[in-house]
Interface confidence: low
Amino acid sequence: MASMGLQVMGIALAVLGWLAVMLCCALPMWRVTAFIGSNIVTSQTIWEGLWMNCVVQSTGQMQCKVYDSLLALPQDLQAARALVIISIIVAALGVLLSVVGGKCTNCLEDESAKAKTMIVAGVVFLLAGLMVIVPVSWTAHNIIQDFYNPLVASGQKREMGASLYVGWAASGLLLLGGGLLCCNCPPRTDKPYSAKYSAARSAAASNYV
């Protein structure tokens, strides 16, 4: 079975990843608008998130506004919301499973069941990591695509916000943590072999005598 240190490391990384997904979800910095044209309306910086956008004045003053309605949102943003929320829930399930299957907890007595639970937790974290990487990478792809598209007016071009980097980090942590937990091989059960061996040995001994 994997060492206790490896298990703790896996859980710690996955929990950090889970927290980072929540941060990524909450921060209104998925996209930052680069207003760099003379024909645009406003010279403010706009931060767009999954739930709200914030207008940052040149003075540093910031005003945030929650999006009006779900239907008004672009489909990619709706999909990103859904995937990130599901990822947070899935990762929470992973945290729960990793606590239950942890070596240093007594929720399960059977070491084999513990190890299997930990592998399931690892797989769950891997799924959560993939669920984060998809919307983050898709959003980044769209931003890059628009930025280098000469048909897109300069006033409409966006840059990648901090949330995307947090999202990638979160995904990396979840995948790494989940991967470490998946290395948790169930213990090989040697009892039938040892019983058989001892019985054979005792029989051999009696025959010898």
């Epitope: 309306v41 767009e48 506004k65 999006y67 672009p74 966006r158």
Partner: antibody, heavy 122, light 111 residues
């Protein structure tokens, strides 16, 4: 509720400048861009310019740069557009229209005044 | 400046039928997230009224028979079923860049 009040009609002689007004109520005047749109009889709509009452920042359709001058009076929540040296070509209905922003920067016209019919005639 | 070409210039539709109005922009007015195209209805002697913003978002208070679609350079306003009160002129308008421009208008009549 949001209201943009404009005089129904204005008569001006050719060459004599005219100042059209638009009184806003029902919202924070200094938080929204105010626009002016022209519509000649039986014709389409033409965006002239807009002004942000908070700092009087203006965005102008270059076609009207020598024709329209936009100002605001914050104390009375009124926007003005002055048309210089009007000719018969300037005879039209002039609307003031507020723009709101979807998420802070995606702009669209949401409220319109009833329009002022400007007649340029001697 | 972006030129918006509306077609047809006038349209006669029977009550209860579908009316389809097209608007073509001289260049794209969409990013991967948003289409900067809006639709207005104007009745004689009245100011324009916002029907649809950002290509497909129906303004609150606007009947569900109005719908908008499209992206890039081609946009469509659909009215189904057409009712008597829909007799108006319809305009598309972009907010992609300044100057903002309007289409030439489509006059909807009842057969």
């Amino acid at each position: 509720q949001v209201q943009l009040q404009q005089p129904g009609a204005e008569l001006v002689r050719p060459g004599a400048s005219v100042k059209l007004s638009c009184k806003a109520s029902g919202y924070t005047f200094t938080s929204y861009w105010m626009n002016w749109v022209k519509q000649r009889p039986g014709q389409g709509l033409e965006w002239i310019a807009m002004i942000h009452p908070s700092d009087s920042e203006i965005r102008l359709n270059q076609k009207f740069k020598d024709k329209a001058t936009l100002t605001v009076d914050r104390s009375s929540s009124t926007a003005y557009m002055q048309l210089s040296s009007p000719t018969s070509e300037d005879s039209a209905v002039y609307y003031c229209a507020r723009i709101d922003s979807y998420y802070g920067y995606l702009f669209y016209f949401d409220y319109w005044g009833q329009g002022t019919t400007l007649t340029v005639s001697s | 400046d972006i030129v918006l070409t509306q077609s047809p210039a006038s349209l006669a539709v029977s009550l209860g039928q579908r009316a389809t109005i097209s608007c073509r922009a001289s260049q794209t007015v969409s990013t991967s997230s948003y289409s900067y195209m809006h639709w207005f209805q104007q009745k004689p002697g009245q100011p324009p009224k916002l029907l649809i913003k950002f290509a497909s978002n129906v303004e609150s208070g606007v009947p569900a028979r109005f719908s908008g679609s499209g992206s890039g350079t081609d946009f469509t306003l659909n009215i189904h079923p057409v009712e008597e009160e829909d007799i108006s002129t319809y305009y598309c308008q972009h907010s992609w860049e300044i100057p903002w421009t309007f289409g030439g208008g489509t006059k909807l009549e009842i057969k």
